[in-house]
């Protein structure tokens, strides 16, 4: 599940990883666009074991995965894209 959040909070990620995470371990992906309190885009991966990892947005694997998820959501296949506005 791909989620896009618009938030006025400051940066959430202290450390970012570029290490590949297989899809079977991912519960959802949260995207925090840059702006307001944080000068950079952040990507947070929520894993099935309940742990959370901040992923480097430049990591090739996450870019590829998000592209796949976007394509799936636009062709109405499973794995929906959720966009939530948070004031």
């Amino acid at each position: 599940v791909l989620e896009v959040y618009y938030t006025s909070l400051r940066c959430r990620c202290v450390q970012e990883s570029s290490v590949f995470i297989p899809r079977r371990f991912i519960d959802r992906i949260q995207i925090l666009p840059r702006g307001n309190g944080c000068p950079r885009k952040e990507i947070i991966v929520w894993k099935k074991n309940k742990s959370i990892v901040c992923v480097d947005p430049q990591a090739e694997w996450i870019q590829r995965m998000m592209e796949v998820l976007r394509k799936r959501s636009s062709s109405t296949l499973p794995v929906p894209v959720f966009k939530r506005k948070i004031p």
Partner: antibody, heavy 119, light 107 residues
Framework: EVQLQQSGPELVKPGASVKISCKAS????????MNWVRQSHGKSLEWIGD????????TYNQKFKGKATLTVDTSSSTVYMELRSLTSEDSAVYYC????????????WGQGTSVTVSS | DYVMTQSHKFMSTSVGDRVSITCKAS??????VAWYQQNPGQSPKLLIY???HRYTGVPDRFTGSGSGTDFTFTISSVQAEDLAVYYC?????????FGGGTKLEIK
């Protein structure tokens, strides 16, 4: 120091079953998924499946469904693999190997258990 | 199943040489690739994960690169102890699959 200690070599007859073990020490047992990998003589590696020690959930390579059963005993930090209906094709070295949710690649390996199927 | 192909079963090299081993995936595996070293009579050892990340304690002469379907494992200056079999493995999707191995030999 992380160690995966496997049970000793097995010589079994065709059609029989065998259960091999892998005892973990030196780390938090539930932090690592445990995999089993087969290596036939002089050949490459084949992934059989893995087990999550937290809940016993298993994922199998379709090729080994019905052949291998993975189980875990958290009280002794041991994982087991039972192989049934053995044939000469199952003669191989079987490795247990662990990966955590930092690497996802198998960073700890047992020493291997040799299984020979012969009448 | 995803097939990992190591085109060279054997590669000849000399101590001090730079050597590259290639691995090709039958489908896109992103950067979900690891490289292992196996010495005779021993268990495999993890060298590289996530295509290019060197595992803890692995000498920096070992490097990995690639994404998608084409991957390369390089030893910048081969040492005598590097003569072994090297396997690539994809962990993009189950079943995890390994390449057939490349045996590094002395010329």
């Amino acid at each position: 120091e992380v160690q995966l200690q496997q049970s000793g070599p097995e010589l079994v007859k065709p059609g029989a079953s065998v259960k091999i073990s892998c005892k973990a020490s030196g780390y938090t047992f539930t932090d690592y998924y445990m995999n089993w990998v087969r290596q036939s003589h002089g050949k490459s590696l084949e992934w059989i499946g893995d087990i999550n020690p937290n809940n016993g959930d298993t994922t199998y390579n379709q090729k080994f469904k019905g052949k291998a059963t993975l189980t875990v005993d958290t009280s002794s930090s041991t994982v087991y693999m039972e192989l049934r209906s053995l044939t000469s094709e199952d003669s191989a070295v079987y490795y247990c190997a662990g990966y955590d949710e930092d690497h996802y690649a198998m960073d700890y390996w047992g020493q291997g258990t040799s299984v020979t199927v012969s009448s | 199943d995803y097939v990992m192909t190591q085109s060279h079963k054997f590669m000849s090299t000399s101590v001090g040489d730079r050597v590259s081993i290639t691995c090709k995936a039958s489908q896109d595996v992103s950067t979900g690739v690891a490289w292992y070293q196996q010495n005779p009579g021993q268990s495999p050892k993890l060298l590289i994960y996530s295509a290019s990340h060197r595992y803890t304690g692995v000498p920096d002469r070992f490097t990995g690169s690639g994404s998608g379907t084409d991957f390369t494992f390089t030893i910048s200056s081969v040492q005598a102890e590097d003569l072994a079999v090297y396997y690539c493995q994809q962990y993009y999707t189950t079943p995890w699959t390994f390449g057939g191995g490349t045996k590094l030999e002395i010329k």
